[in-house]
Interface confidence: low
């Protein structure tokens, strides 16, 4: 999906709003420092096609966060304020239905939300900035 | 207004090295990349690299990669690029220019440095 | 890396005429581009972003369009301040990288 048609200060003020308080809850006892950001982004459309692939994308060890409340929450927000991105995620979505929940927040898990909440801080800052 | 102020001109002899500076004003400085951009005489613009002066972080060309160093100094809002073992075809304008989106809204007057025996 | 070509390299036009400028990319870079004007002994100017986003302060005579791998820069009416040289620019990813340039001299 081509994130450059989104409406970038609406997304801002969602993650700000709701996103970011659940990716904190979800790695609460767990210490930014813990993990090295190995995954960057260099522009805002950028950031945002990183965002969507830790979050909806299975890896390996982390089977699937896309279930997770900030995730639910990640996707209505780009469905909302990106154009045409919900009908490119119908196939996705249908696919992700036949995978288990996760039922247990791996290390690894928790690795792939502290590089999501490093990928969101570099797709907010500007906001952030100003306030 | 935003504004991109570079070092002056350089005249240096092969081997040398030389630091050029970018002072920026006008806006948040960590809130932008600040990127370094090669014009040779007569010839087009070619991306050395780009720093993130909220953390420092780097990305280089790899052309550019043991040839250009780039830091920040977020006290005065400065970016420098430092050229090591000058060359003659290191001769050319240096421009900074910052980013938010990956393309380059202000760009500083440019800075000639010239490698010469 | 993406490897960005301009066509032409120059052209000679009239004021009032109207002005095409091409850039191709070696891959599909969806609508992440960017056109510059430099004239001579001047930083380069942004003209356009994200393929048709016209950059403010910038008259409505220039357009871009595009997406994917084929892109163009169009000038609807050459004006005398106009004649410059026009660089392309991916902003996909890094490395960032430009086109060649294309000159536009007066006729």
């Known amino acids: 999906y081509d994130f450059t048609n989104c409406d970038f200060q609406k997304i801002e003020a969602d993650y700000l709003r709701t996103i970011s308080k659940d990716l904190i809850t979800y790695m609460s006892g767990t210490k930014s420092t813990d993990f090295n950001n190995t995954v960057s982004c260099s522009n805002r459309p950028h950031c945002l096609t990183e965002i969507q692939s830790l979050t909806f994308n299975p890896t390996p060890r982390c089977a699937s966060l896309a279930k997770e409340m900030f995730a639910r929450k990640t996707k209505a927000t780009l469905a909302l304020w990106c154009p045409g991105y919900s009908e490119t995620q119908i196939n996705a979505t249908q696919a992700m239905k036949k995978r288990r929940k996760r039922k247990v927040t791996t290390n690894k898990c928790l690795e792939q939300v502290s590089q999501l909440l490093g990928l969101w801080r570099r797709f907010i800052r500007t906001l952030l900035k100003k306030q | 207004q935003v504004q991109l102020v570079q070092s002056g001109a350089e005249v240096k002899k092969p081997g040398a090295s030389v630091k050029v500076s970018c002072k920026a004003s006008?806006?948040?400085?960590?809130?932008?990349?600040m990127h370094w951009v090669k014009q040779a005489p007569g010839q087009g613009l070619e991306w050395i690299g780009v720093?993130?002066?909220?953390?420092?972080?780097?990305t280089y060309n790899q052309r550019f990669k043991g040839k250009a160093t780039l830091t920040v100094d977020t006290s005065t809002s400065t970016a420098y690029m430092e050229l090591s073992s000058l060359r003659s075809e290191d001769t050319a304008v240096y421009y900074c220019?910052?980013?938010?989106?990956?393309?380059?809204?202000?760009w500083g007057q440019g800075t000639l440095v010239t490698v010469s025996s | 890396d993406i490897q960005m070509t301009q066509s032409p390299s120059s052209l000679s036009a009239s004021v009032g005429d109207r002005v095409t400028i091409t850039c191709r990319a070696s891959?599909?870079?969806?609508?992440?581009l960017a056109w510059y004007q430099q004239k001579p002994g001047k930083s380069p100017k942004l003209l356009v972003y994200?393929?048709?986003t016209l950059a403010a302060g910038v008259p409505s005579r220039f357009s871009g369009s595009g997406s994917g791998t084929d892109f163009t820069l169009t000038i609807s009416s050459l004006q005398p301040e106009d004649f410059a040289t026009y660089y392309c620019q991916h902003h996909y990813d890094t490395p960032w990288t430009f086109g060649q340039g294309t000159k536009v001299e007066i006729k």
């Open positions: 220019t910052r980013s938010l989106d990956g393309f380059f809204d202000y």
């Open positions: 720093i993130d002066p909220y953390d420092a972080d780097t």
């Open positions: 891959e599909n870079i969806y609508s992440y």
């Open positions: 006008g806006y948040t400085f960590t809130s932008y990349w």
């Open positions: 994200f393929a048709k």
